[in-house]
C-alpha cells in the first residue's frame, strides 16, 4: 500500500511569548515544529516515529497564522508518506520549538528549546475530508486539520490496493476509489480487454478488435456476419454453411448454373401445349388437338378432329370446314337423322328406339360401340388419358398407358427419380433424364456416375474442331466431341460430304 | 506446465523473408487471459519487443517494424507465427515468443529457450 | 517513441542491497515489470506491476514504481543474483523494454 498523513497547520498562539520551562524567548519565540507518527499507543511513548516525521522551518514568532504553500521550503499541509498498508488507526505528536538559529533549517542549530508540545491517539479512515482540531494548555494554542489520502495509483479503505488507469490492448480502464476497474466504453470483460462487438454481430461467425466492429470469419458476410457466402462461381443457387451451392429449384449443375426447369423458365410450348422437362435445356411439347410441330406452334387442317357424325366427309375451307352427309343425315355434322326404326340404322347389335311419335330414333349401343347409329367401336385412348407423353393402348373392353422411361402410375402421373438414390459419387450433381440419370461431375472427376479421378482435364487442350462441345466424363479418362450441324468425326474435324469410302462415323 | 518452443531455419539470406513458428504445449492458445509476443535480442545486446497476437487474431507491432512484421495464429494446431520481410544484417538475433499475461498487467511469464536467426548470404 | 532507461551496470557485495532504476516519462503512471537473464538463458520475469512477485520468486526481489522512476531492490544479495536485469513498460500498444543493467556480485 502507499498513502500520505497529511496534516495543515493554521494558527499558534503564544501571547506571552513564553517556553515550556516557564522562560520568555528574547525578543521573541521564532516557532519551528516537529511532528512524529506512529503506530497506535494507548500510552504515548518516546521510540521511533514508525509511520514518519518531519520538521519544519521557522513559520513565525510567538502568535502567528499559517499560509498553504504548496512547495520549497514551509510547506503547508505537511506530508508524510508511508508505504504500508494503512492500519486505520494513529498516534500524532507535534512540537512547537524556539531557535536562535537559522530559520530554514532550525532542526540543527543548538540550543533549541521546547515551547510546547501535543499529543493525539486516535483512527482515522481513508478519506479527502479534512478532520479540524484545536489544542490548548495554559500557554499555547494549536489550530491544525489532518487527514490521509491514498497516493496516486492507489486505492480502497486502506490505499492497498494498486490500479493504474491504462488504454491498450492489456486493457482499456479507469480505476474506481475502490480501486476495482471501471471499463472504457466499448470494452469488457475482467481487465476491459475484450471489446464490445457491433450490436448483433454474430457470435461465431463474426468478431472484431475494437469497439462497434464486426469482421467477418472466412465464409461469411453482411454487416452482422450473419449471411454465408456461396461457392465462388454459384448462379442459381444459396448456401446455409459456407461455399455451399445449393441449387434454387429447376437447377443443376456444380454452379447451378444448368437449366433443368426450361419449361417453366422458358415456356417454349405455344397453343396451350402442354411441356415436359427431360434433363438440361431438354423439352417435349404435348400437344393439343389440332396442333403440330415440335413447339406446337403449326395449326393442322380443320378437318383433323373428324368433326362430321354418321360417316360425314370433312372438306377443309379457308377458316372453316364443310361436312358432305351420307343419304338419310343433315345438319352442320350430319347430325340429324331422316331415318326411323323401320330403316334398322342401328349396326352391331345396337338396339333402335323410337322417338318424336316414330319421326326419329335413338340407337343404344351393346359395350365397346359408340356413335349415333353404334357404328363406331369405342377407342378409350380419345381422351388422350396418358400423362408425360405416355402411349394409350386399347386392349379389348378397356385400355392401358404405356409409360415413357422415369415414369409410372395408371395414367403415366408418377415421376419416378433416378437420382432417388443418388448414384453420382464425389459430389455430382444428378439429372432424371429419359434414358436414365445424368451425372454432371465436379472438376477431377470423369465417368458415367463421377467414379473415375482424372489426373487432368481431357477437354483442357480444347481437342474438338469447328465449334464442336467437348465433354468428359462420358468415357473414363477421356472426351467426347459433340459435332455441330455439317461435321463429323470423333474430334468433328471433316465435313458432312466426304467420299463414303472414308473411314470417320460421325 | 506451458512450455513454449520455436522452430524455424537459422540461417536466411539478405532481403528475404524470416519464418519463425513457436508451438505452445501445455495449454490452449486460445485462452482468452494472454496475448502471445515475439522478443529478439540481438547479440551482446538488450532485448527488443516485436509485436503479439491474440487468439482471435488480433495483432499489435513495434511501430519501427510494423511495415516489415507479419504475426499470425493457428489455433488448431497451438501455435503462433512471425515473419518478418526484407531481412538485414542487422534483424540477426536470437528471437523468442513469450506469453504475456491479461493478469499481470502484460508482464511475459513465460519463455520460449530461443533461437539464434543470423542474416548472411 | 517512448524510452526507458538503465545504468549500465551496478555492483554489489554478497548480503548486500542492490538497487537498478528505470526511468521514463511519467513511468509512475505504467505498470513496470522487471526480467532477469542470465548469460545463454531465456528471460525470467522477476517483478510485475511494479511490485508483485510471480510464484517462485524469492521474497528478496521487491519492487517499487512512482514519478519518472521505477526501481528494483534486491535485499541480501546473492551470487546466484548476478545476471542481466531489464525493466520494461506499455506505451499504448507497445511494449518497451530498458537497455539493460548487469548486476556484478562481489
Known amino acids: 500500500g502507499s498513502g500520505i498523513f497529511q496534516l495543515r497547520l493554521q494558527e499558534f498562539v503564544n501571547q506571552r511569548g513564553m517556553l515550556a520551562n516557564g522562560q520568555s524567548c528574547e525578543p521573541g519565540c521564532r516557532t519551528f515544529f516537529r511532528i512524529c507518527l506512529k503506530h497506535f499507543q494507548a500510552t504515548f511513548s518516546e521510540g521511533p516515529c514508525t509511520f514518519g516525521n518531519v520538521s519544519t522551518p521557522v513559520l513565525g514568532t510567538n502568535s502567528f497564522v499559517v499560509r498553504d504553500k504548496n512547495s520549497g521550503s514551509g510547506r503547508n499541509p505537511l506530508q508524510l508518506p508511508f508505504n504500508f498498508t494503512w492500519p486505520g488507526t494513529f498516534s500524532l505528536n507535534i512540537q512547537a520549538w524556539h531557535t536562535p538559529g537559522d530559520d530554514l533549517r532550525p532542526e540543527t542549530s543548538p540550543g533549541n528549546s521546547l515551547i510546547s508540545q501535543i499529543i493525539i491517539q486516535g483512527s482515522l479512515a481513508v478519506g479527502k475530508i479534512w478532520r479540524t482540531d484545536e489544542q490548548n494548555d495554559t500557554l499555547t494554542r494549536l489550530s491544525y486539520s489532518y487527514r490521509v489520502i491514498c497516493s496516486d495509483n492507489y486505492y480502497g479503505e486502506s490505499c492497498s490496493r494498486l490500479c493504474k488507469k491504462r488504454d491498450d490492448h492489456f486493457g482499456h480502464y479507469e480505476c474506481q476509489p475502490d480501486g476495482s476497474l471501471s471499463c472504457l466504453p466499448g470494452w469488457t470483460g475482467k481487465y476491459c480487454d475484450q471489446p464490445i462487438c457491433l450490436s448483433g454481430c454474430h457470435e461465431q461467425n463474426g468478431y472484431c478488435s475494437k469497439p462497434d466492429e464486426c469482421i467477418c470469419r472466412p465464409g461469411w458476410q453482411g454487416r452482422l456476419c450473419n449471411e454465408c457466402i456461396p461457392h465462388n462461381g454459384c448462379r442459381h443457387g444459396t448456401c446455409s454453411i459456407p461455399w455451399q451451392c445449393a441449387c434454387d429449384e429447376g437447377w443443376g449443375g456444380l454452379f447451378c448454373d444448368q437449366d433443368l426447369n426450361y419449361c417453366t423458365h422458358h415456356s417454349p410450348c405455344k397453343n396451350g401445349s402442354t411441356c415436359s422437362n427431360s434433363g438440361p435445356k431438354g423439352y417435349t411439347c404435348t400437344c393439343l388437338p389440332g396442333y403440330t410441330g415440335e413447339h406446337c406452334e403449326l395449326g393442322l387442317s380443320k378437318c383433323a378432329s373428324n368433326p362430321c357424325r354418321n360417316g360425314g366427309s370433312c372438306k377443309d375451307q379457308e377458316n372453316s370446314y364443310h361436312c358432305l352427309c351420307p343419304p338419310g343425315y343433315y345438319g352442320q355434322h350430319c347430325e340429324h337423322s331422316t331415318l326411323t326404326c323401320a330403316d334398322s340404322p342401328c349396326f352391331n347389335g345396337g338396339s333402335c328406339r323410337e322417338r318424336n311419335q316414330g319421326s326419329s330414333y335413338a340407337c343404344e349401343c351393346p359395350p365397346n360401340f359408340t356413335g349415333s347409329n353404334c357404328e363406331k367401336k369405342v377407342d378409350r385412348c380419345t381422351s388422350n388419358p396418358c400423362a408425360n407423353g405416355g402411349q394409350c393402348q386399347n386392349r379389348g373392353p378397356s385400355r392401358t398407358c404405356r409409360c415413357r422411361p422415369g415414369f409410372t402410375g395408371t395414367h403415366c402421373e408418377l415421376h419416378i427419380s433416378d437420382c432417388a438414390r443418388s448414384p453420382c459419387a464425389h459430389g455430382g450433381t444428378c439429372h432424371d433424364l429419359e434414358n436414365g440419370p445424368v451425372c454432371t461431375c465436379p472438376a477431377g472427376f470423369s465417368g458415367r456416375r463421377c467414379e473415375v479421378r482424372i489426373t487432368h482435364d481431357a477437354c483442357a487442350s480444347g481437342p474438338c474442331f469447328n465449334g464442336a462441345t467437348c465433354y468428359t466424363g462420358l468415357s473414363p479418362n477421356n472426351f467426347v466431341c459433340n459435332c455441330p450441324y455439317g461435321f463429323v468425326g470423333s474430334r468433328c474435324e471433316f465435313p458432312v460430304g466426304l467420299p463414303p469410302s472414308f473411314p470417320w462415323v460421325a | 506446465e506451458v512450455q513454449l518452443q520455436e522452430s524455424g531455419p537459422g540461417l536466411v539470406k539478405p532481403s528475404e523473408t524470416l519464418s519463425l513458428t513457436c508451438t505452445v504445449s501445455g495449454g490452449s492458445i486460445s485462452s482468452s487471459s494472454y496475448y502471445w509476443g515475439w522478443i529478439r535480442q540481438p547479440p551482446g545486446k538488450g532485448l527488443e519487443w516485436i509485436g503479439d497476437i491474440y487468439y482471435t487474431g488480433s495483432t499489435y507491432y513495434n511501430p519501427s517494424l510494423k511495415s516489415r512484421v507479419t504475426i499470425s495464429v493457428d489455433t488448431s494446431k497451438n501455435q503462433f507465427s512471425l515473419k518478418l520481410s526484407s531481412v538485414t544484417a542487422a534483424d540477426t538475433a536470437v528471437y523468442y515468443c513469450a506469453r504475456q499475461a491479461l493478469a499481470m498487467g502484460g508482464g511475459s511469464d513465460k519463455w520460449g529457450q530461443g533461437t539464434l536467426v543470423t542474416v548472411s548470404s | 517513441s517512448y524510452e526507458l532507461t538503465q545504468p549500465p551496470s551496478v555492483s554489489v557485495s554478497p548480503g548486500q542491497t542492490a538497487s537498478i532504476t528505470c526511468s521514463g516519462q511519467?513511468?509512475?503512471?505504467?505498470?513496470a515489470s522487471w526480467y532477469q537473464q542470465k548469460p545463454g538463458q531465456s528471460p525470467v520475469l522477476v517483478i510485475y506491476?511494479?511490485?508483485k512477485r510471480p510464484s517462485g520468486i524469492p521474497e528478496r526481489f521487491s519492487g517499487s514504481n512512482s514519478g519518472d522512476t521505477a526501481t528494483l531492490t534486491i535485499s541480501g544479495t546473492q551470487p546466484m543474483d548476478e545476471a542481466d536485469y531489464y525493466c520494461?513498460?506499455?506505451?499504448?500498444?507497445?511494449?518497451?523494454f530498458g537497455y539493460g543493467t548487469k548486476v556484478t556480485v562481489l
Open positions: 520494461q513498460a506499455w506505451d499504448r500498444d507497445t511494449g518497451v
Open positions: 511519467r513511468l509512475g503512471d505504467k505498470y
Open positions: 506491476e511494479d511490485s
